[in-house]
């Protein structure tokens, strides 16, 4: 999946299996990524687990779990708030669009989480105070989570180089160079560009991610995934000058 | 005013049960510098607070007492404390600590928010 870190680095990661997205004193978010096509290096998120840790008079420990084709509007115990404590309403799940869009507000830690199902896969977005982001007891282990450190270098796909490459190639050459060797050849570059431009008129990294995803999978749902990811940034990012990220040299992991 | 948070972090960093910075080690000076930094960060919201002024004077006192230089390494807090509370409430029966923005930032600017997102392939 494509990852935008807390420090506004943008990466495309091929991480497979379960990885920690966030792991701090209040919250643990784990994602499971699976290959989008057999033999493909590109992966997308098929499962998401969020653990809200027990916190003082506010919330009991609550677990939220979403999987492909299952985006519940409740915690695994069936509740929609933080439990029986006085401040239970400082943690709330709201269903925005049934089966497609859920928002979790954790007011006790100033945090908003948006989970969506777009096509077969899940997207995740969070707004969190820096103090909560950095509330990590053991930096050696907890500090390794993806939202903070990004993906390990050996798990990154240089999709910007792929994109530059794609502009000068036909679909046949592209499919061979693609991280998804079995990607359909019926999806020309021009079509991918047109589809992405429709939803993402600014040629930023979200637009480029969209093009990459269409060329890699042939699945037009990924256009919507990039579109909603940017919409979530607009809603959740505090710096409106940083909504769009643009091409730059590839980052080393933090 | 977050002065109690600064105090608690300093007490925690320099007290006995966690391999402390004893009062004649470089770690003690580092803990003092961290404490001074913490008090500076909260200064704007602590004007007129006696506990704050007591902390500032106490730091100066200990700095000179232990020959600590103002510059030098600071210590990392051993354990980040939980988001602090002020005296606003989300609703009448909800403890004030359960509303991060209202309670913590009642006296200061809004917190620095960060964003992380994951999507697509």
């Amino acid at each position: 999946p494509h990852l935008r870190t807390f420090t506004d680095r943008f990466q495309t990661c091929k991480v497979q299996g379960a990885w920690p997205l966030i792991d701090n004193n209040y919250l643990n978010v784990q994602v499971t990524n699976t290959p989008v096509l057999p033999g493909s290096a590109a992966t997308a998120t098929s499962k998401l687990t969020i653990i809200f840790k027990n916190f003082q008079e506010c919330v009991d420990q609550k677990v939220y779990q979403a999987e492909m084709d299952e985006l519940p509007a409740a915690f695994v115990d069936g509740s929609k708030n933080g439990g029986d404590k006085h401040g239970a309403n400082s943690l709330k799940i709201t269903e925005k669009v049934s089966g497609q869009h859920v928002e979790i507000q954790a007011k006790y830690i100033g945090t908003t989480i948006v989970v969506r199902q777009v096509g077969r896969y899940l997207t995740f977005a969070v707004r969190m105070p820096e103090e909560v982001v950095n509330a990590v007891e053991d930096w050696d282990s907890q500090g390794l989570y993806l939202c903070l450190r990004g993906c390990p270098l050996n798990q990154q796909i240089d999709f910007q180089a792929f994109h530059t490459n794609a502009e000068g190639t036909g679909a046949r050459r592209l499919a061979a160079a693609s991280p998804a060797p079995t990607a359909p050849e019926t999806f020309p570059y021009e079509t991918a560009v047109a589809k992405c431009k429709e939803k993402l008129p600014v040629e930023d990294l979200y637009y480029q991610a969209c093009v990459f995803d269409l060329l890699t999978t042939g699945d037009v749902n990924f256009t919507l995934a990039a579109y909603y990811a940017l919409e979530d940034v607009k809603m959740l990012h505090s710096n409106k000058d940083k909504l769009h990220l643009y091409e730059r040299t590839r980052d080393l992991p933090g | 005013c977050k002065i109690l948070k600064c105090n608690s972090e300093f007490w925690s960093a320099t007290s006995g049960s966690h391999a402390p910075a004893s009062d004649d080690t470089p770690e003690f000076c580092a803990a003092l510098r961290s404490y001074a930094l913490c008090t500076r960060r909260t200064a704007r919201t602590c004007r007129g607070d006696l506990a704050y002024h007591s902390a500032v004077h106490g730091i100066e006192d200990l700095m000179s007492q232990h020959n600590c230089s103002k510059d030098g390494p600071t210590s990392q807090p051993r354990l980040r404390t939980l988001p602090p509370a002020g005296d606003s409430q989300e609703r009448s029966d909800s403890p004030e600590i359960c509303h991060y923005e209202k309670s913590f930032h009642k006296h200061s600017a809004t917190p620095n928010y960060t964003h992380c997102g994951l999507f697509g392939d």
Epitope: - | L4, S8, S54, A55, L62, P84
Partner: antibody
Framework: EVQLVQSGAEVKKPGASVKVSCKAS????????ISWVRQAPGQGLDWMGW????????NYAQKLQGRVTMTTDTSTSTAYMELSSLRSEDTAVYYC?????????????WGQGTLVTVSS | QSALTQPRSVSGSPGQSVTISCTGT?????????VSWYQQHPGKAPKLMLY???KRPSGVPDRFSGSKSGNTASLTISGLQAEDEADYYC?????????FGGGTKVTVL
């Protein structure tokens, strides 16, 4: 004037719970911790724990863990100490004390004490 | 059994000096700036007399002084007066615990 005023004496049966209040005035409540200390008849002082009214963080004496709960209400500048599963050896005067300011940890202002008698 | 050890009692005549010791470990006393002393008269709440080993809060007479040597902190009352007859407790903050001494009864003969 800085003051801590505690609730009145209580008589409780074994197994019951007691909740003692401690109302602070004359200072910024969230800038000082509150410690709770008890003293059995004819005995020394026994530290029970402390709470930060600022963050809600608590630190309880190990031997009371699971039985003691300390809370604060910053809207009324009041600290509370609740002790459950009372036994006869919990009969004591319970004091709240303000934790001093600045780099030094000490208890500079004390409540008048609340006598809790546990008797069947 | 208290974590900090104090003598059960000490006594002196008016005008004399008495010293109360408070012995702990290196972490609870030896390396700590968190040793304080409290006076308690019968039926009353304790009163802070010294903090940070040697510092006197305002309102405490200067005949009360503190010192520390190794893992032992001491409170000295010089020029003992009748109103100094009381129990005295030392405490030390040791991170996850606040440690009290068992208390020392000071008697003015």
């Amino acid at each position: 004037e800085v003051q801590l005023v505690q609730s009145g004496a209580e008589v409780k049966k074994p197994g019951a719970s007691v909740k003692v209040s401690c109302k602070a005035s004359g200072y910024t409540f969230t800038s000082h911790g509150i410690s709770w200390v008890r003293q059995a008849p004819g005995q020394g002082l026994d530290w029970m724990g402390w709470i930060s009214p600022y963050s809600g963080n608590t630190n309880y004496a190990q031997k009371l863990q699971g039985r003691v709960t300390m809370t604060t209400d910053t809207s009324t500048s009041t600290a509370y100490m609740e002790l459950s599963s009372l036994r006869s050896e919990d009969t004591a005067v319970y004091y709240c004390a303000r934790v001093g300011s600045g780099p030094y940890y000490y208890m500079d202002v004390w409540g008048q004490g609340t006598l809790v008698t546990v008797s069947s | 059994q208290s974590a900090l050890t104090q003598p059960r009692s000490v006594s002196g005549s008016p005008g004399q000096s008495v010293t109360i010791s408070c012995t702990g470990t290196s972490s609870s006393v030896g390396d700590s700036i968190y040793v304080s002393w409290y006076q308690q008269h019968p039926g009353k709440a304790p009163k802070l007399m010294l903090y940070d080993v040697t510092k006197r809060p305002s309102g405490v007479p200067d005949r009360f002084s503190g010192s520390k040597s190794g893992n032992t902190a001491s409170l000295t009352i010089s020029g003992l007066q009748a109103e100094d007859e009381a129990d005295y407790y030392c405490i030390s903050y040791a991170g996850t615990d606040t440690l009290f001494g068992g208390g020392t009864k000071v008697t003015v003969l």
